[in-house]
Interface confidence: low
Amino acid sequence: EAHKSEIAHRYNDLGEQHFKGLVLIAFSQYLQKCSYDEHAKLVQEVTDFAKTCVADESAANCDKSLHTLFGDKLCAIPNLRENYGELADCCTKQEPERNECFLQHKDDNPSLPPFERPEAEAMCTSFKENPTTFMGHYLHEVARRHPYFYAPELLYYAEQYNEILTQCCAEADKESCLTPKLDGVKEKALVSSVRQRMKCSSMQKFGERAFKAWAVARLSQTFPNADFAEITKLATDLTKVNKECCHGDLLECADDRAELAKYMCENQATISSKLQTCCDKPLLKKAHCLSEVEHDTMPADLPAIAADFVEDQEVCKNYAEAKDVFLGTFLYEYSRRHPDYSVSLLLRLAKKYEATLEKCCAEANPPACYGTVLAEFQPLVEEPKNLVKTNCDLYEKLGEYGFQNAILVRYTQKAPQVSTPTLVEAARNLGRVGTKCCTLPEDQRLPCVEDYLSAILNRVCLLHEKTPVSEHVTKCCSGSLVERRPCFSALTVDETYVPKEFKAETFTFHSDICTLPEKEKQIKKQTALAELVKHKPKATAEQLKTVMDDFAQFLDTCCKAADKDTCFSTEGPNLVTRCKDALA
């Protein structure tokens, strides 16, 4: 239904707290360099204006679209050109082009320092002094570093943060209460960020149809007892919600997500038997819970997939009459039978099925042509299964850090032109797949591994798009989203690469490394490892292991030495010489 004032409508639906949080996220995601105070001031102005519209929908400017209202606010910021360069040109455009322009200027890798967590006492003091401002800072800092973070989910993580602080700040040992809990929230939020970025990439590059296919597969796996019409309705609604969030329409997105959660909870009987626990929770927790609810038990009496999609005499007729619906039902039927497959794999199978029908339905004897299609799925299924087995075996043998190093070597060989920080970030993220997925039961490993890897590789592609340096990466990133992971897996050593010269300073370290947190130490060592591979792309695993063991021993020795500086300055050059010899 049309509302006289869109901003009043959203304020009423969402309530002041969520309204303010979402406006803050929106501004922080668009203008990523502005300080919290600058954004907080704009948020207050927008909220005050929304309240005047709630009181009188006919008041001046209350009928304007949210894009117009928010865009005007952003464009009124002083020194916009000095701080944001060509983004200021967006302000010369009219809606909807102005909003599109803002979206195009979102930076996936802003040059902001890492979000450092203050120590426990300081955190608790500022939280107690002003919880609202404290949470505002959290929303601002996360949103500007992750400009596509799913806004209603970010409100959920802020709520989690709030609950943890409320609990832990009342304890004697605040540090040991806060650290593991906040680490857990951070890890989940980072995964949520890369997953959502993948959804927005899908929407931006391939449109709503591609995202809807993803949603049909995912929902069919989770709700195998829901019928196709129900799954289609949920997929359509979910597509709308994600389109809005990816497009910067955060108030509409959060409002529609709440509506979808309400619908699901009112229609549990036709969706899934597993929703009740989620539906008993308050809004943010409810929507989050529904998004990761466990799969419903599969119906026991599902007929073989071949009956409708291979053996039926009307296959080509059904396909010709309504291609999207027929392919949609295939994806639905296949996905509900395979919660053990990744969504990426299911979409590859649907694509293979579509290509087979396109070819075979034009031939003289279609059934003879498409009769073997299910058997032709086998290699497509085996490939990711082997990937999971090989990588989980390696992870179980090496542990997370060793596994990350193995991936780092592999990916540096595949794309040595990519910057070392990007390679290290990618390898560390890809390596976490072991901890995240390899401990799961067998039937959950494949979907966990492949869909997580796809999301991480999407980030690699986004970063590479900014400064393309590797033909290998460009090739894999140019294809469809579901083919990316197999493409990267199939890459081998880049034979066109001219090895980097050996620079001693790249492998020169100082005593300050000793006081770094473990994570930072690992990154330093991994940076050196990537540089070694760039110097000797064909070094054997054994050679690299020798050098890295030597390096670890050197750090251990010098960090325990009484005179660390002397140890580093005398032993460092010896280490460099030994490295060169080992790799000769």
Epitope: P180, G184, E187, K188, G399, T435, C438, T439
Partner: nanobody, 114 residues
């Protein structure tokens, strides 16, 4: 070398409780997901529960959901399985394993019988 030592098994009546503990050494415990698996007399290995390296992600087999709780203490290199409302069908040798690997230890016998 890698060592895993389970303890805490025993004879318990149906409805009773036990706490199994697994002490790890010889590897960086905090870097690995861990699981509990069990083998009932004359049966194959059955996966029971798993926990991620940082303890944030816990999974259970349907047969034990709501009755068993897995936890870990990375500082003490210790994995725990709290078992409540035990049933005769829980009778088995329980092993702790790295990731989803195979048992490489003696295990601990749990017998549920009246």
């Amino acid at each position: 070398q890698v060592q895993l030592q389970e303890s805490g098994g025993g004879l318990v009546q149906p409805g009773g409780s036990l706490r199994l503990t697994c002490t790890a050494s010889g590897f960086t415990f905090r870097s690995f997901g861990m699981s509990w698996v069990r083998q009932a007399p004359g049966k194959g290995l059955e996966w029971v529960s798993a926990i991620s390296a940082d303890g944030s992600d816990k999974r259970y087999a349907d047969s034990v959901k709501g009755r068993f709780t897995i936890s870990r203490d990375n500082g003490k290199k210790m994995l725990t399985l709290d078992m409540n409302s035990l049933k005769p069908e829980d009778t088995a040798v329980y092993y702790c394993v790295i990731g989803r690997g195979s048992p490489a230890s003696q295990g601990t016998q749990v017998t549920v019988s009246s």
